[in-house]
């Protein structure tokens, strides 16, 4: 699996997750957000030869068929396919509120 | 939606579904298919700015963080969203053999 | 320029809802709280509540007893004001207001043009 | 919750006077250093305009003529050289406790 584990422990050219740490005021613009001040996001990055985690069957007939045409604009992408919550907290007025949002933390990626 | 409704009669730049036609002798060196000689496949391009059709939080967080950050190389990417099957007729020695093959047609994009 | 634009006023019977629409431009939308808050003919200003568009985040004045409901279309940057079970106290302009940026509950920098709702049988 | 309470409910001031509007708390709304304290103007017909952000900040575009000042409960907004354009109903609110509230206005 193209995880942080094995992504982060390599130097891997191809699609893997790379590192990637988000400033919530600095990056987003966010200043509300109390804990954290940024975090860990992660992000997808490297190309999609053919047969390299393949997403659908799709994605294998676009890989091949950039091997048989290697200058086509058609090709698969490395996106996120785990993806983890992150818990924040905020204030609302004086009061704290702490909120689990989804999707927030790349754990691993795929060609699709 | 980022579908063939809307991006074949457009022309829109930025991710969106694309005309592309696979030829399975030429462009994939599947000899043994027989009918059909190809078809149209489809692919996904374009650029994923913010608010573009965006598939998860993390997706949202990551243009954001493009857009205050222009040179950084995390951003979304455009990948196929909603995925067609096609029938295909192949010969098992005389024997003609119909088969559905999932996730091959391209209907629309999305930024991930 | 970052303009805040409602829809039309609305003329509806008790018991009915109302959802009110703020369509937002010149701003990143998923950047910015959004506040929704009413005006009762001759009367001052009551905030309802407000939403965090980029995950739908929403804290609410508990006056308004669970009637108000707010929701956020970021693929469109338009925010929603849901309002149900309505009586004639209900009758009020309802302003969208852009939260200032710093904290969650904050002073309001940009304003909608008002959408008068109208209860009557 | 927070009751805010201005004072004068409505004013007339010449033009070129000072006018002053105050607003009490019904407890202190500050917190961590600021005085989460902001005032509005609401011109007849119109949407209200942010004027003085956390007590005593000038909201950029606004006016100078405009200036606030106070802490804890206490709060003072200030329009020197009184215009006919400033006519309006004026409003103080606070956010340092939920839920959000408002002065009642002062015309």
């Known amino acids: 699996a193209l995880d942080t584990n094995y992504c982060f422990s390599s130097t891997e050219k191809n699609c893997c997750v790379r590192q990637l740490y988000i400033d919530f005021r600095k990056d987003l613009g966010w200043k509300w957000i109390h804990e954290p001040k940024g975090y860990h996001a992660n992000f997808c990055l490297g190309p999609c030869p053919y047969i390299w985690s393949l997403d659908t069957q799709y994605s294998k007939v676009l890989a091949l068929y950039n091997q048989h045409n290697p200058g086509a604009s058609a090709a698969p992408c490395c996106v996120p396919q785990a993806l983890e919550p992150l818990p924040i907290v905020y204030y609302v007025g004086r009061k704290p509120k702490v909120e689990q949002l989804s999707n927030m933390i790349v754990r691993s990626c795929k060609c699709s | 939606a980022l579908d063939t409704n809307y991006c074949f009669s457009s022309t829109e730049k930025n991710c969106c579904v694309r005309q592309l036609y696979i030829d399975f002798r030429k462009d994939l060196g599947w000899k043994w298919i027989h009918e059909p000689k190809g078809y149209h496949a489809n692919f996904c391009l374009g650029p994923c700015p913010y608010i573009w059709s965006l598939d998860t939080q993390y997706s949202k967080v990551l243009a954001l963080y493009n857009q205050h950050n222009p040179g950084a190389s995390a951003a979304p990417c455009c990948v196929p969203q909603a995925l067609e099957p096609l029938p295909i007729v192949y010969y098992v020695g005389r024997k003609p053999k119909v088969e559905q093959l999932s996730n091959m047609i391209v209907r629309s994009c999305k930024c991930s | 320029e970052v303009q805040l634009v409602q829809s039309g006023a609305e003329v509806k019977k008790p018991g009915a809802s109302v959802k009110v629409s703020c369509k937002t431009s010149?701003?990143?939308?998923?950047?910015?709280?959004m506040n929704w808050v009413r005006q009762a003919p001759g009367a001052g200003l009551d905030w309802m509540g407000q939403?965090?568009?980029?995950?739908?985040?929403?804290n609410y004045n508990e006056m308004f007893e669970g009637r108000v409901t707010l929701t956020a279309d970021t693929s469109t940057s338009t925010a929603y004001m849901e309002l149900s079970s309505l009586r004639a106290g209900d009758i009020a302009v309802y302003y969208c207001?852009?939260?200032?940026?710093?904290?969650?509950?904050?002073?309001?920098?940009?304003w909608g043009q008002g959408t008068l709702v109208t209860v009557s049988s | 919750d927070i009751v805010m309470t201005q004072t004068p409910p409505s004013l007339s001031v010449s033009p070129r006077e000072t006018a002053s509007i105050s607003c009490r708390a019904s407890?202190?709304?500050?917190?961590?250093?600021?005085?989460?304290m902001h005032w509005y103007l609401q011109k007849p017909g119109q949407s209200p305009q942010l004027l003085i952000y956390?007590?005593?900040n000038l909201e950029s575009g606004v006016s100078d003529r405009f200036s606030g000042s106070g802490s804890g409960t206490d709060f003072t907004l200030r329009i020197s050289r009184v215009e006919a354009n400033d006519t309006g109903v004026y409003y103080c609110?606070?956010?340092?406790?939920?839920?959000?509230?408002f002065g009642q206005g002062t015309k």
């Open positions: 407890e202190s709304v500050d917190s961590y250093g600021n005085s989460f």
């Open positions: 609110q606070q956010n340092d406790e939920d839920p959000l509230s």
């Open positions: 939403i965090f568009p980029a995950w739908g985040s929403t």
């Open positions: 207001a852009r939260g200032y940026g710093n904290y969650a509950l904050d002073a309001m920098d940009y």
């Open positions: 010149g701003y990143t939308f998923i950047k910015y709280w």
């Open positions: 956390l007590a005593s």
